[in-house]
């Protein structure tokens, strides 16, 4: 009775993400077979959140627009090692939009989830970012510097990542 | 190439407003912000602040707040700056200058002159 | 506000020689330090950006160099068309601030 209720609970909160994502990968956490993780399909998934690269070419609002019809944001990165992690299922040629943005071109960065923006957990290419009017940040890579980040003008379209916190069942 | 083409000189009465124009060319006007620097003899140069030829937003240094309103004309590719109240302290030559990289002027229009007086 | 400071107001040279004018800054401004020319006539032209990059059409014998609160301007061989008012600027903080110029003129 227990176990029905579970999965009771388990399908009602499927349904829930259905409208945006018609599949789920789920993992088990842990030892416990009552708890999974799950990140929709074609995403990947790196400790408590899920990302997909959106291959679109779209300006930073649309970008942005686009993850959250998905129930996401364009992608906050908290840690080096979640950059790593992004960086590995992205194209050296091309440039990505983040979660982070001037908005008025005061050199006042902002990330999309108010996470605040924290200088010493930055990743800039040097010399970035130097322009007033360019006040949305891309991810791309630089052979000198490999992958870091670069302020750019916010209607020049480009492709983005999403990321979304795992859906918990 | 780039080009900056200011407004003639202005000798204007204390007290009253002058509105000063900066005309872009050779470049995609609304990709790059406008400043605004005045010149005078006690002062040297002074950033007076920044608009946004795309967003129309503007950046002021609190010194110019009340005195001087930046604002663009996109279609005409042309930057204005409206300077209010004017007193003797108004008195200089003043400068558009296209934004760069590297928060850097990289392109200065050849100056308005400004002069008030009685 | 950053304060930017150029000590020597004038300097007189000979053509042919080195100059060097130095500007300096009240905090650290990460290098963004620019160096504008300004002509008798009023004329004002960016020469060196971002501490040491050299503006398009700028001759080379201009150069600049510098970091933290200390930076220079330095001619390497003076021409007589480099008489001019030199200005350093900052673009680490707003408001950009300006140091109050050295004019150079001719032995």
């Known amino acids: 009775n227990f176990m029905y209720s579970k999965t009771v609970k388990r399908l009602s909160k499927l349904r829930e993400y259905q409208q945006y994502h018609p599949s789920l990968t789920c993992v088990m956490e842990g030892k416990d077979i009552e708890d999974w993780s799950c990140c929709p399909t074609p995403w990947t998934s790196f400790q408590s959140s899920c990302y997909f690269i959106s291959t679109g070419m779209q300006s930073w609002t649309k970008s942005q627009k686009n993850c959250s019809v998905m129930g996401a944001d364009l992608v906050v990165i908290n840690t080096r090692e979640e950059q790593d992690f992004i960086i590995q299922n992205l194209k050296r040629n091309s440039s990505y939009f983040l979660g982070l943005s001037d908005p008025g071109g005061r050199r006042h960065w902002q990330w999309v989830d108010q996470t605040p923006y924290n200088e010493n957990v930055t990743f800039w290419h040097s010399g970035e970012p130097n322009n007033l009017d360019e006040r949305c940040a891309i991810i791309n890579f630089r052979s000198s510097e490999e992958w870091g980040w670069n302020d750019i003008h916010c209607h020049v379209p480009q492709k983005s990542i999403c990321k979304m916190k795992k859906i918990y069942i | 190439q780039v080009q900056l083409q200011q407004s003639g000189a202005e000798l204007v009465r204390p007290g009253v407003s002058v509105k000063i124009s900066c005309k872009g060319s050779?470049?995609?006007?609304?990709?790059?912000?406008m400043h605004w620097v005045k010149q005078s003899h006690a002062k040297s140069l002074e950033w007076i602040g920044v608009i946004s030829t795309y967003y129309g937003d503007s950046n002021y240094n609190q010194k110019f707040k009340g005195k001087a309103t930046m604002t663009v004309d996109k279609s005409s590719t042309t930057a204005y700056m409206e300077l209010a109240r004017l007193t003797s302290e108004d008195s200089a030559i003043y400068y558009c200058a296209r934004n760069g990289n590297f928060y850097v002027m990289d392109y200065w229009g050849q100056g308005t002159s400004v002069t008030v007086s009685s | 506000d950053i304060q930017m400071t150029q000590t020597t107001s004038s300097l007189s040279a000979s053509l042919g020689d080195r100059v060097t004018i130095s500007c300096r800054a009240s905090?650290?401004?990460?290098?963004?330090l620019n160096w504008y020319q300004q002509k008798p006539d009023g004329t004002v032209k960016l020469l060196i950006y971002y501490t040491s990059r050299l503006h398009s059409g700028v001759p080379s014998r201009f150069s600049g160099s510098g970091s933290g609160t200390d930076y220079s301007l330095t001619i390497s061989n003076l021409d007589q068309e480099d008489i001019a008012t030199y200005f350093c600027q900052q673009g680490n903080t707003l408001p950009w601030t300006f140091g109050g110029g050295t004019k150079l003129e001719i032995k």
């Open positions: 905090q650290d401004i990460s290098n963004y």
């Open positions: 050779g470049y995609t006007f609304t990709d790059y912000s």
